[in-house]
């Protein structure tokens, strides 16, 4: 590339016209501030290409860099570029204007930076000061670039004198950013929503001041973009948050939402994903099974638990024999439904010191505007058995009878046993079971009655002994699921003068 005049620095008069020419073996173009100003391009007979840039009515604002470059660098060995710097001293222009990117200088490490205050005249003396400070800072100045050095987090201005007036530049703000490795967390207000409701997700990064967020989500794949909002959660260390909000969700919005965070300074990145489910309508579903018959033990506390899934949050009611239950002031009943995860619930009915009257038909109903579920079971109150009576009698028939009466829930079993050697029973000799043989020695008759009001069974059993020739220890044992009880009586022969 050949540039005329060759530069590399030119000082031109204000209001004048000046022509710059660039030529090369391939198409060439002049560039100014990353743009191509109007210019005349030509191709000579010898095959060389040229571009002529005519600068007319020059002002101080024409001060700056001009580049000549190949129009299409493909196929060329070098991406050659010629730089020319033009000054147009102009007393009406103090410092050249800066855009916002130049006024705020962000750093991530201690490094040399340039405060780009530039004047139109290379002869001017320019000094650097802290903003609102008078003392000039000892930093080298390049008229084409500005002040270069290592700067603290402060604001700075440049000063020069044009004629008899002092001119200040805009203030330049130097700020050191915090960067570190990236750790991302993603959460959603709800991971399950009904169609028409909103999806709101938050992606949070801690400890970095400069990050870019990128979300991928089902809607994006179909070209329907949603603009996330980024803000500071504003705790120390820095918490930065990006919020993705999708109003009026559709079924197609179900799927994986991924937040990718990059930090360009050190090229760190991290991403996290979360699944969102959009349902057509709400639901309530029982989890696990609860048997239709449940048990509680008299005077003990019992908690009945139902686990279910629901969205949106349901109302939960408990009923006993079709009457609504509530927490009792006496503390006999406690109801609680707790959210163990976003859509999973545990509802508990606690009966404190269970009473017989609390047996009955229980129903839990969970419902909202879209769905409902109910679960019913019978609650049986188990009562430990008690032997209420054990008596012996001598009917005229000559046989001897022993009667045992007891109660309990569930229905008690009765076991009769006897021991003939009083000295060694029951420690050394096991008692003999009675009534389960066809021997004529003994006969057994048992009757069972269910008492509705007390909700328990009564067992009455009569043991008939044919001939008792020596004292006999007879034992009645009642047993059910929650306990057992035993009583004992000594049966003596008719001929003996005593009985116990």
């Amino acid at each position: 590339l050949v540039v005329t005049p060759p530069g590399p620095e030119l000082v031109l008069n204000v209001s004048s016209t000046f022509v710059l020419t660039c030529s090369g073996s391939a198409p060439v173009v002049w560039e100014r501030m990353s743009q191509e100003p109007p210019q005349e391009m030509a191709k000579a007979q010898d095959g060389t290409f040229s571009s002529v840039l005519t600068l007319t009515n020059l002002t101080g604002l024409d001060t700056g860099e001009y580049f000549c470059t190949h129009n299409d660098s493909r196929g060329l060995e070098t991406d050659e570029r010629k730089r020319l710097y033009i000054f147009v001293p102009d007393p009406t222009v103090g410092f050249l204007p800066n855009d916002a990117e130049e006024l705020f200088i962000f750093l991530t490490e201690i490094t040399e930076i340039t405060i780009p205050c530039r004047v139109t005249d290379p002869q001017l003396v320019v000094t650097l000061h802290e903003k609102k400070g008078d003392v000039a800072l000892p930093v080298p100045y390049d008229h084409q670039r500005g002040f270069s050095g290592i700067f603290e987090d402060r604001s700075y201005i440049c000063k020069t004198t044009i004629g008899d007036r002092e001119v200040d530049s805009d203030a330049y703000y130097v700020y050191r950013l915090q960067v570190s490795s990236i750790n991302v967390s993603v959460n959603a207000v709800q991971t399950v929503v009904r169609q028409g409701e909103n999806i709101t997700l938050m992606c949070i990064v801690i400890g970095n001041e400069v990050v870019n967020f990128e979300w991928t989500y089902p809607r994006k794949e179909s070209g329907r973009l949603v603009e996330p909002v980024t803000d500071f959660l504003l705790d120390m260390p820095y918490h930065i948050r990006s919020i993705l909000h999708i109003p009026s969700a559709e079924l197609e919005d179900s799927g994986t939402y991924t937040c990718n965070v990059t930090e360009s300074v050190n090229d760190h990145q991290d991403e996290k994903a979360i699944n969102i489910t959009v349902v057509e309508s709400g639901y309530v579903r029982l989890l696990g099974e609860v048997g239709t018959l449940q048990f509680a033990e008299l005077h003990r506390s019992r908690t009945l638990q139902v686990v279910f899934e629901a969205y949106p949050p349901p109302t939960v009611l408990w009923f006993k024999d079709n009457r609504t239950l509530g927490d009792s002031s006496a503390g006999e009943i406690a109801l609680s439904t707790r959210n163990v995860s976003e859509t999973r619930y545990v509802s508990e009915l606690t009966l404190v010191r269970v009473k017989v009257a609390e047996a009955g038909h229980y129903t839990m109903r969970a419902f909202h505007e879209d769905a409902e579920v109910q679960l019913s079971f019978q609650l049986q109150i188990n009562v430990p058995v008690r032997v209420l009576e054990l008596s012996e009698s001598h009917p005229d028939s000559g046989e001897q009878t022993v009667r045992c009466r007891g109660r309990g829930m569930p229905q008690p079993n009765i076991i009769w046993s006897a021991c003939r050697d009083l000295k060694r029973c029951p420690r050394e000799l096991p008692p003999t079971l009675l009534g389960n043989s066809s021997e004529e020695e003994s006969q057994l008759e048992t009757n069972v009655t269910y008492w509705e009001e007390e909700q328990e069974f009564e067992v009455v059993s009569t043991l008939r002994l044919q001939h008792v020739d020596r004292p006999l220890s007879v034992r009645c044992t009642l047993r059910n699921a929650v306990g057992q009880d035993t009583q004992e009586v000594i049966v003596v022969p008719h001929s003996l003068p005593f009985k116990v």
Epitope: A100, L103, E209, V211, F232, L234, H239, S242
Partner: antibody, heavy 127, light 107 residues
Framework: QVQLVESGGGLVQPGGSLRLSCAAS????????MSWVRQVPGKGLEWVAN????????YYVDSVKGRLTISRENVKNSLYLQMNGLRAEDTAVYYC????????????????????WGHGTMVTVSS | AIQMTQSPSTLSASVGDIVTITCRAS??????LAWYQQKPGKAPKLLIF???SLESGVPSRFSGSGSGTDFTLTISSLQPDDFATYYC?????????FGQGTKVDIK
């Protein structure tokens, strides 16, 4: 040298309109966010609105949304506040201020305060 | 909107005193807080930005501290020129809110 001068204030009836102007000098106006802040005499400061360098982003306090509009003309180094549907509670001194909001760093803005203020212009809404 | 609460509303002090003004945000604002000084009939003047950074030209007797929700402006030795009203101001997601102000007057 760096200066902001407000104008356009005055007495207006409730429901009326007014247009405030702010003339900037001594700095590259087109490189800065700008804000309007108001102050009821004897009371505290209330931020009203702000806008970015090219006017593509504008933000307002809730109480003025839909009634007050911020705008700018960079070639004229001027900031404006169009006030419609004025109410008695809009009576205040209105200040124009330079808002130090750097270009986005990553996905968000930094903030270094309002470093240059005008002297204010009084708006009185009364019948 | 984020609310800013300053205390006290009025503070009486003498030249040479150490003066402390506090500002509390209704939610965390990191260190996005500025302090301003205003004298009667004048426009506010920026003193401190980003909670603790002193604006150029502001005397070093002014200092700011705090982050999250609780912030403090301290004047280490009150001077005659410092009798004024002081305001804190937060920045969060493009909006700004000022505190109600603290008037520092002569005891």
């Amino acid at each position: 040298q760096v200066q902001l001068v407000e104008s356009g204030g005055g007495l207006v009836q409730p429901g009326g309109s007014l247009r405030l102007s702010c003339a900037a000098s001594g700095f590259t106006f087109s490189s800065y966010w700008m804000s309007w802040v108001r102050q009821v005499p004897g009371k505290g400061l209330e931020w009203v609105a702000n806008m970015n360098q090219d006017g593509t982003e504008k933000y307002y306090v809730d109480s003025v949304k839909g009634r007050l509009t911020i705008s700018r003309e960079n070639v004229k180094n001027s900031l404006y506040l169009q006030m419609n549907g004025l109410r008695a509670e809009d009576t205040a001194v209105y200040y124009c201020a330079r808002d130090l909001v750097p270009p986005r760093q990553g996905d968000y803005y930094y903030y270094f305060g309002m470093d240059v203020w005008g002297h204010g212009t009084m708006v009185t809404v009364s019948s | 909107a984020i609310q800013m609460t300053q205390s006290p509303s009025t503070l009486s002090a003498s030249v040479g005193d150490i003066v402390t003004i506090t500002c509390r945000a209704s939610q965390s604002i990191s260190d996005w807080l500025a302090w301003y000084q205003q004298k009667p009939g004048k426009a506010p003047k920026l003193l401190i930005f980003k909670a603790s950074s002193l604006e150029s030209g502001v005397p070093s007797r002014f200092s700011g501290s705090g982050s999250g929700t609780d912030f403090t402006l301290t004047i280490s030795s009150l001077q005659p020129d410092d009798f004024a009203t002081y305001y804190c101001q937060q920045y969060n997601s493009y909006s700004r809110t000022f505190g109600q102000g603290t008037k520092v007057d002569i005891k």
